[in-house]
Amino acid sequence: QGWQAFKNDATEIIPELGEYPEPPPELENNKTMNRAENGGRPPHHPFETKDVSEYSCRELHFTRYVTDGPCRSAKPVTELVCSGQCGPARLLPNAIGRGKWWRPSGPDFRCIPDRYRAQRVQLLCPGGEAPRARKVRLVASCKCKRLTRFHNQSELKDFGTEAARPQKGRKPRPRARSAKANQAELENAY
């Protein structure tokens, strides 16, 4: 099956408070993610991935503690983040006069969580407070999901996508990438 290579038992711990955890700074709008020489990953970051091919929607893992105010999980948890590009660029440059705008060469896809599961984590609190149990949501796998031009910019920001460049005469399309960035593009698997 097309996704088997990316599936594994590691999970992402997501605070119950409703928001996603902040991805590491390297994952946010970092141009090095699109560079072949870095293996599709930020350098010097303790990520591991089951699939080392570049430009894949893949599950990256790192370790952190779950916190709630002064309380902290007894053990660090392995967190999963969906990262990477879903295929080759599907936005092409169009030069009109001196300006440049972007037009699509195919639908756009975004690497996002696919399936979730829930787990309880025990939190230890200072000052002799009783341990707390916290229910957290875990990402079980990732997928390349269709993105339309009707998705708003705040949604894009949630997933750390690059800011869209407006297209002439229509709403901005997501994930426009420069022709130069495209040159570094290698193979992808879905």
Epitope: R90, K143, E185
Partner: antibody
Framework: EVQLVQSGAEVKKPGASVKVSCKAS????????MHWVRQAPGQGLEWMGE????????GYNQKFKGRVTMTTDTSTSTAYMELRSLRSDDTAVYYC????????????????WGQGTTVTVSS | DIQMTQSPSSLSASVGDRVTITCRAS??????LNWYQQKPGKAPKLLIY???RLLSGVPSRFSGSGSGTDFTLTISSLQPEDFATYYC?????????FGGGTKVEIK
């Protein structure tokens, strides 16, 4: 008229490689990613992957990853699909296809297809 | 991958009959569902995209409906040239996947 014309039928032995070509005409070749879809005898359709003719960047169905390479030659408006380590179950008709777009619904579909290239893998 | 299940896999009908083919996705694919017609020895031809949008030049006897996971292709009055195999295809999640096909044969 938009057309995709593919190379002729091939007979290959197991373990060999095949390279199928797809020549585009009637539109600007670099305006659309090129896709490849295959169909085994009496079976359904299976999407293999796509390539951006501008950048040469390709995306493959994981099922074929490591065995398939898609390339383009913009000077001749031709796309190529090479499949390696052929097995008998790779016997199929291979199609190149180009997407069409509806701006109102922001939707895409396989609009233009090549005539297909029959690849037979047999010892 | 998203599995696309078509039913029936084959059917026999007469000219003038109303024919309905269903396609079920293993997960929600919104309206990103296309229908193709294929005749023996030929490449598939697009009939309907975005669930219900008829491609220009396709006869109005073809129609599509549904959303989410369940979709339908209807031929209101079957014509001799409609005997073929029909495939659905989802465009919501990579890799793109197709249904197994429904062969419409002459009764």
């Amino acid at each position: 008229e938009v057309q995709l014309v593919q190379s002729g039928a091939e007979v290959k032995k197991p373990g060999a490689s095949v390279k199928v070509s797809c020549k585009a005409s009637g539109y600007t070749f670099t305006d659309y990613n090129m896709h490849w879809v295959r169909q085994a005898p009496g079976q359904g359709l299976e999407w293999m992957g796509e390539i951006n003719p501008n950048s040469g960047g390709a995306g493959y169905n994981q099922k074929f990853k490591g065995r398939v390479t898609m390339t383009t030659d913009t000077s001749t408006s031709t796309a190529y699909m090479e499949l390696r380590s052929l097995r008998s179950d790779d016997t199929a008709v291979y199609y190149c296809a180009r997407l069409g777009y509806d701006d109102i619904y922001d939707d895409w579909y396989f609009h233009v297809w090549g005539q297909g290239t029959t690849v037979t893998v047999s010892s | 991958d998203i599995q696309m299940t078509q039913s029936p896999s084959s059917l026999s009908a007469s000219v003038g009959d109303r024919v309905t083919i269903t396609c079920r996705a293993s997960q929600d694919i919104s309206n990103y569902l296309n229908w193709y017609q294929q005749k023996p020895g030929k490449a598939p031809k697009l009939l309907i995209y975005h669930t219900s949008r008829l491609l220009s030049g396709v006869p109005s006897r073809f129609s599509g409906s549904g959303s989410g996971t369940d979709f339908t292709l209807t031929i209101s009055s079957l014509q001799p040239e409609d005997f073929a195999t029909y495939y659905c295809q989802q465009g919501d999640t990579l890799p793109y996947t197709f249904g197994g096909g429904t062969k419409v044969e002459i009764k």
